[in-house]
């Protein structure tokens, strides 16, 4: 039992549990498709344990293979809304440092308004996560129907 | 090498490994919106290890973050049939104790007959987590099909 | 601190990590719905850390309870294809053993050209995980848009 | 609840057409498939066809060749059933149904009936 | 279309006694964890009125003496204890797809 204890008075981050749930703060401006996110407990259910937010964007702190998922609504759509503002996509992927850029995660949303995945990736110390929303509809920013976070797994 | 084997004798809910995978039992009277659940291996390959059901619904016994996911496909469903009955909504969210209440997990099924999704997002001992499925439609009770679960990530 | 360096220094089998994920390498022949993986650094992200491939399909060597998860992504598709060639069904299953056998996740493309889930099950070593993708339709190989894994959650 | 409100009997010639008319009480007329069955006269059930009032959408058993069209008027939450080329086997009581909660084809509600006799 | 087959065609039973009615259909009528199998009762100059739905739901009103079961294509109505007001013809309804189709009918009697 001794051992159980002596794991819980350990700093977490030495486990490596990193961790981050966040919500939609805004768009960007017209020509830039990326979505900026925010967390804290201030704001209601979103957090980071470990990794940052840079400018909107999610800061990598620890390597590792992560746990990488997001929903997002768009708003006021309806599936024909949808069908007409196709092709409405979402990427999420590596967009700094350069040298690793790459879409980690895409879907369009076709006749749907809500898009939802998840994926396993290795990423590093600095890896900036960004995702991008391309079409002219406007994402929700209801914290339960928008959100985007990542999972420390294992190193 | 000991420790690994000492880690192993530990009780594995000191380790704060709750987790549980429910299949839909039943849904409710006309006037209550909520699935409600069930879980076991007798029942297949469902199970609790932590959280416990109340009544159908999913009680937290262990405080921390937690990753909620769930899959709901509509019975005798077709992309018809889904855009007729639009809207059709899934929401997840804590509905005891009502000081904490909060929807945490919002789809629409729009011109499709399966919501899938899943989020981090911090838990207390005691939340009772609800699914309501709000429509004219009836949920698959097929396993492969609709399923709700949760797993404790980190304190 | 010295505990968790020594945590640090035992190798990550004996803590349970079992993780993969992997892209699609290409269909079956005709007759045949599964669907044929790969994964390595070689090949970009995708990894295999505890399980292995046979023949294209994931064979699990630990057991224990596992989150499963795929996204598929039909290839030069709209939803008028898609709804065009429905039936298209996902199916993620325990192809192997024989006595094993069971549909495990299973989803319609119905109006939409991706879906993606995951699910918390059980699994046992010598588990061969198969996913069966009928109808008319090519998957994408794009590897941001078709992927499945699997991670160990606890035993 | 809901009250299913069906229009008088009527007696029709061979070749004429029939319409029928229910009318449903509460605010729900328009996310409930209304169904159309008739029963012949000491005879079992048929299922003619439905209509989604939402959207107008029909579903028509092929038995009926063409010779059934359903509508709805959503601004007075009412269906109709209109049946052609009438013959004397069209004799028959038909019911408008719907469902209580789920839109599933089974039938909670029924209208009181409407007899229609074909005769020359 | 499905094809729905009840037997017996007529039943006499006693006050008190055991009714069971079974209806076959020509293919399964179950789909998604359910059985779209449905029971209704008709009196002379009255619309059908509905019993059980989905297989073995008793719908809201009727008297706990009526059950139904069964899954695939086999279903069964029982009726626990025949009262003098079950006097009535009974008809099996599947939803599994369109057209929805009914059995012939059974017509219950007092013996």
């Known amino acids: 039992q001794r051992f159980a204890q002596a794991q819980q008075q350990l700093p977490l981050e030495s486990l490596g549990w990193d961790v981050a749930e966040l919500q939609l703060n805004h768009t960007g401006p017209q020509q830039d498709p990326r979505l900026y996110w925010q967390g804290g407990p201030a704001l209601g259910r979103s957090f980071l344990h470990g990794p940052e937010l840079d400018k909107g964007q999610l800061r990598i702190h620890r390597d590792g293979i992560y746990m990488v998922h997001i929903q997002v609504t768009l708003a006021i759509c309806s599936s024909t809304t949808a069908s007409r503002h196709h092709p409405t996509t979402l990427a999420v992927g590596i967009c700094s440092p350069a040298s690793r850029s790459i879409s980690l995660l895409r879907l369009s949303f076709h006749q749907g308004c809500t898009i939802a995945s998840q994926r396993l990736t290795p990423l590093a110390r600095g890896d900036t996560l960004c995702t991008n929303l391309t079409g002219t509809l406007l994402p929700s920013r209801n914290t339960d129907e928008t959100f985007f976070g990542v999972q420390w797994v294992r190193p | 090498q000991r420790f690994a084997q000492a880690q192993q004798q530990l009780p594995l809910e000191s380790l704060g490994w709750d987790v549980a995978e429910l299949q839909l039992n039943h849904t409710g009277p006309q006037q209550d919106p909520r699935l409600y659940w069930q879980g076991g291996p007798a029942l297949g390959r469902s199970f609790l290890h932590g959280p416990e059901l109340d009544k159908g619904q999913l009680r937290i016994h262990r405080d921390g973050i937690y990753m909620v996911h769930i899959q709901v496909t509509l019975a005798i469903c077709s992309s018809t049939t889904a855009s007729r009955h639009h809207p059709t909504t899934l929401a997840v969210g804590i509905c005891s104790p009502a000081s904490r209440s909060i929807s945490l997990l919002r789809l629409s099924f729009h011109q499709g007959c399966t919501i899938a999704s899943q989020r981090l997002t911090p838990l207390a001992r005691g939340d009772t987590l609800c699914t309501n499925l709000t429509g004219t439609l009836l949920p698959s009770r097929n396993t492969d099909e609709t399923f709700f679960g949760v797993q404790w990530v980190r304190p | 601190q010295r505990f968790a360096q020594a945590q640090q220094q035992l190798p990550l089998e004996s803590l349970g990590w079992d993780v993969a994920e992997l892209q699609l390498n290409h269909t079956g022949p005709q007759q045949d719905p599964r669907l044929y993986w790969q994964g390595g650094p070689a090949l970009g992200r995708s990894f295999l850390h505890g399980p292995e491939l046979d023949k294209g399909q994931l064979r699990i060597h630990r057991d224990g309870i596992y989150m499963v998860h795929i996204q598929v992504t039909l290839a030069i598709c709209s939803s008028t294809t898609a709804s065009r060639h429905h039936p298209t069904t996902l199916a993620v299953g325990i192809c192997s053993p024989a006595s094993r056998s069971i549909s495990l996740l299973r989803l319609s493309f119905h109006q939409g050209c991706t879906i993606a889930s995951q699910r918390l099950t059980p699994l046992a070593r010598g588990d061969t995980l198969c996913t069966n993708l009928t109808g008319t339709l090519l998957p994408s190989r794009n590897t941001d848009e078709t992927f499945f894994g699997v991670q160990w959650v606890r035993p | 609840e809901v009250q299913l409100v069906q229009s008088g009997a009527e007696v029709k010639k061979p070749g004429s057409s029939v319409k029928v008319s229910c009318k449903a009480s509460?605010?729900?007329?328009?996310?409930?498939?209304m169904h159309w069955v008739r029963q012949a006269p000491g005879q079992g059930l048929e299922w003619m066809g439905a209509i989604f009032p939402g959207n107008g959408e029909t579903s028509y058993n092929q038995n009926f060749k063409g010779r059934v069209t359903l509508t709805a008027d959503k601004s007075t939450s009412t269906a109709y059933m209109e049946l052609s080329s009438l013959r004397s086997e069209d004799t028959a009581v038909y019911y408008c149904?719907?469902?209580?909660?789920?839109?599933?084809?089974?039938?909670?509600?029924w209208g009181q009936g409407t007899l229609v006799t074909v005769s020359s | 279309d499905i094809v729905m087959t009840q037997s017996p065609d007529s039943l006499a039973v006693s006050l008190g006694e055991r009714a069971t009615i079974n209806c076959r259909a020509s293919?399964?009528?179950?789909?998604?964890?359910?059985?779209?199998m449905h029971w209704y009762q008709q009196k002379p100059g009255q619309p059908p009125k509905l019993l059980i739905y989905l297989a073995s739901n008793l719908e809201s009103g009727v008297p706990d003496r009526f059950s139904g079961s069964g899954s695939g294509t086999d279903f069964t109505l029982t009726i626990s204890s025949l009262q003098a007001e079950d006097v009535a013809v009974y008809y099996c309804q599947h939803s599994r797809e369109f057209p929805p189709t009914f059995g012939q009918g059974t017509k219950l009697e007092i013996k």
């Open positions: 293919k399964s009528v179950s789909s998604s964890g359910y059985s779209f």
């Open positions: 149904a719907r469902n209580s909660y789920y839109d599933y084809a089974w039938f909670t509600y």
């Open positions: 509460g605010d729900t007329f328009p996310r409930y498939n």
